[in-house]
């Protein structure tokens, strides 16, 4: 069947998901549409211990995460909510800002060298985390 | 021998509609992104379409956008390309070619020899 | 979209010359490059990806270096099945790869 049973070559597995860590950089929705091409989409961040796994693996290297305001308020690539979700933003941030004289705010999400979250400018070529989750079918436990 | 082998091609009038197939074999198909590059005569190479190796997301060029249609068959091993409202300038050799991705990089590793579509009057 | 210029288009060339192929991207790409080989007739080859990442069964006189705008294709000690057209291309822009416009080599 198409069920995702376990992960891909090169992926890791952490809590009935998949991950891939890259280690060269895009843009924010270059990295975005490689993870959607991987049937994947860019890391969403839903707990302190899914925070502390991929921090554990990228080290302190800016790296894009699937959280963004391009279209207004923040959200995450694959429709968890914002809102009532986990947050690890470094203090003052996000803080749109307008000063790095490249065009425009920051409405990009992406862990920082010490974990915490900034926004950032789109186009930055930074590290990226894909997630995808193995399939709920493949999760139930065998008929005895 | 691992193999793409393209299909469907031939003449057809502006505004017509064709199907182009690349049936696979040999490999992992369903495991690999794949993609539709044409070539028109004498001239580059352009990029079309591509399609994730599970068929969940869909990309195009925005010379295409709109009229052409990229979809694969995993359990037949087979991509398509369905061309509507065609035009002149997509008179090409049109080669399915799966994606190569490594480290985060990104190429194309297998082609098929390719299939000629004109667009004439 | 990311433009890709290639020189020079053409060049005649011997048997056993050393030959280099120059790729120019519109933007930095990092090192996001491949070159193809393509053959009258025939569907185009990978060579090298990753800018200086030799593809498995490729023969060890083709190499590519560069990174940021600029790249090349070395061919060290032309053989006669190297005669054909070669193509850059960026993978930065994922999906939107775009190519080059080919560079011609043939026999002097």
């Known amino acids: 069947g198409s069920e995702r049973t376990c992960c891909p070559v090169n992926w890791v597995e952490h809590e009935r998901s998949c991950y891939w860590f890259s280690r060269s950089g895009k843009a924010w929705a270059d990295a975005d549409n490689y993870c959607r091409l991987e049937d994947a989409h860019l890391v969403v961040v839903t707990s302190w211990e899914e925070q502390k796994f991929v921090q554990h693996h990228i080290g302190p290297v800016n790296t894009w995460m699937g959280l963004h305001d391009q279209n207004g308020p923040w959200k995450w690539v694959d429709g968890t909510d914002y809102e009532t979700g986990f947050k690890n933003w470094r203090p003052e941030q996000p803080d749109d800002w307008y000063g790095h004289g490249l065009g425009g705010g920051e409405d990009c999400a992406h862990f920082t060298d010490d974990g915490r979250w900034n926004d950032d400018v789109c186009q930055r070529p930074y590290r990226w985390v894909c997630e995808t989750e193995l399939d709920k079918a493949s999760q139930e436990p065998p008929l005895l | 021998e691992v193999q793409l082998l393209e299909s469907g091609g031939g003449l057809v009038q502006p505004g017509g509609s064709l199907r182009l197939s690349c049936a696979a074999s040999e490999f992992t198909f369903s495991s690999y992104a794949m993609s539709w590059v044409r070539q028109a005569p004498g001239t580059g190479l352009e990029w079309v379409s591509i399609?994730?190796?599970?068929?969940?997301?869909?990309f195009y060029a925005d010379s295409v956008k709109g009229r052409f249609t990229i979809s694969r068959d995993n359990s037949k091993n087979t991509l398509y390309l369905q061309m509507n409202s065609l035009r002149a300038e997509d008179t090409a050799v049109y080669y399915c070619a799966s994606r190569l991705a490594v480290a985060g990089s990104e190429a194309f590793d297998i082609w098929g020899q390719g299939t000629m579509v004109t667009v004439s009057s | 979209d990311i433009q890709m210029t290639q020189s020079p288009s053409s060049l005649s060339a011997s048997v056993g010359d050393r030959v280099t192929i120059t790729c120019r991207a519109s933007q930095s790409i990092s090192s996001y490059l491949n070159w193809y080989q393509q053959k009258p007739g025939k569907a185009p080859t990978l060579l090298i990806y990753?800018?200086?990442s030799l593809q498995s069964g490729v023969p060890s006189r083709f190499s590519g270096s560069g990174s940021g705008t600029d790249f090349t294709l070395t061919i060290n000690s032309l053989q006669p099945e190297d005669f054909a057209t070669y193509f850059c291309?960026?993978?930065?822009?994922?999906?939107?790869?775009?190519f080059g416009p080919g560079t011609k080599v043939d026999i002097k």
């Open positions: 990753a800018a200086s």
């Open positions: 291309q960026q993978s930065y822009r994922t999906p939107f790869f775009t």
């Open positions: 399609i994730s190796g599970r068929g969940g997301n869909t």
